[in-house]
């Protein structure tokens, strides 16, 4: 194709010379998911007063959402690349059942909920390629996940709204911690 005026074709590189690095790709993937979470949180907070609620502890007792702890090696003090990467992958695998729960919880953002779920699966694949010690990663038991899902879906409306809010908030925090840690790797 002809080069527009003022442009010099020999300076313009072909697109295949510009792939993202593995780190850039992971960074982008996490930010993509965080953007989706942000949209879902907006709908949740507009729909109910969960975001201002002080009764979170009641619902949190039913949930075992992954959290970063000092021992996971993801914080600046005591940072350990391998331990941290295992924690991030394990945590994401544990979040998958909760992301499945979110699938029927949104009206106007149904597509966003799907995007968060799908892009998390892709992120797990990227990170598994990066991990050297895949044996240390424990995959959640499908039977346990299935019964957890049934239990969550059987909750009353208030608890379901609160669960949705807590999942989104915890997942956001987990991803933000992961993003900071991965940038050190």
């Amino acid at each position: 194709a002809p080069v527009p005026p003022g442009e010099d074709s020999k300076d313009v590189a072909a697109p295949h010379r510009q792939p993202l690095t593995s780190s850039e790709r992971i960074d982008k993937q996490i930010r993509y998911i965080l953007d989706g979470i942000s949209a879902l949180r907006k709908e949740t907070c507009n729909k109910s007063n969960m975001c201002e609620s002080s009764k979170e502890a009641l619902a949190e007792n039913n949930l075992n959402l992954p959290k970063m702890a000092e021992k996971d090696g993801c914080f600046q003090s005591g940072f350990n690349e391998e331990t941290c990467l295992v924690k991030i992958i394990t945590g994401l695998l544990e979040f998958e059942v909760y992301l499945e729960y979110l699938q029927n919880r949104f009206e106007s953002s149904e597509e966003q909920a799907r995007a968060v779920q799908m892009s998390t699966k892709v992120l797990i694949q990227f990170l598994q390629k990066k991990a050297k010690n895949l044996d240390a990663i424990t995959t959640p038991d499908p039977t346990t996940n299935a019964s957890l899902l049934t239990k969550l879906q059987a909750q009353n409306q208030w608890l379901q709204d609160m669960t949705t809010h807590l999942i989104l908030r915890s997942f956001k925090e987990f991803l933000q911690s992961s993003l900071r840690a991965l940038r050190q790797m």
Partner: nanobody
Framework: AVQLVDSGGGLVQPGGSLRLSCAAS????????MDWYRQAPGKQRELVAS???????MLDDSVKGRFTISRDNAENTVYLQMNSLKPEDTAVYYC???????????WGRGTQVTVSS
């Protein structure tokens, strides 16, 4: 696959303006995160501006207050409005689309921006 056509580059004097456009083919534009990168000769590629699916924008510190990024989902196009251009903005500007569903990135061929008196 998504195909991107970036355009709008050219030769401009310091202090001038340009508006870059990046048109995407396909029906998945609304789920793509869009970026503008630039690469000056002999330098590392750098991320200039990003616009997320939600419309949230991010600009590199070096262009804040001068550049703006926007998207038109109906037109499958992302724009980079560049004002108060400086000689150090001279580079090839690349449009990039990122699909989080698949983790795939798609690149335009690049459009040359030259800021010189």
């Amino acid at each position: 696959a998504v195909q991107l056509v970036d355009s709008g580059g050219g030769l401009v004097q310091p202090g001038g303006s340009l508006r870059l456009s990046c048109a995407a083919s396909g029906s998945i534009f609304s789920r793509l995160a869009m970026d503008w990168y630039r690469q000056a000769p002999g330098k590392q590629r750098e991320l200039v501006a990003s616009i997320a699916v939600s419309g949230t924008t991010m600009l590199d510190d070096s262009v804040k207050g001068r550049f703006t990024i926007s998207r038109d989902n109906a037109e499958n196009t992302v724009y980079l409005q560049m004002n108060s251009l400086k000689p150090e903005d001279t580079a090839v500007y690349y449009c990039m689309a990122f699909d989080g569903y698949t983790g795939s990135d798609y690149w335009g061929r690049g459009t040359q921006v030259t800021v010189s008196s």
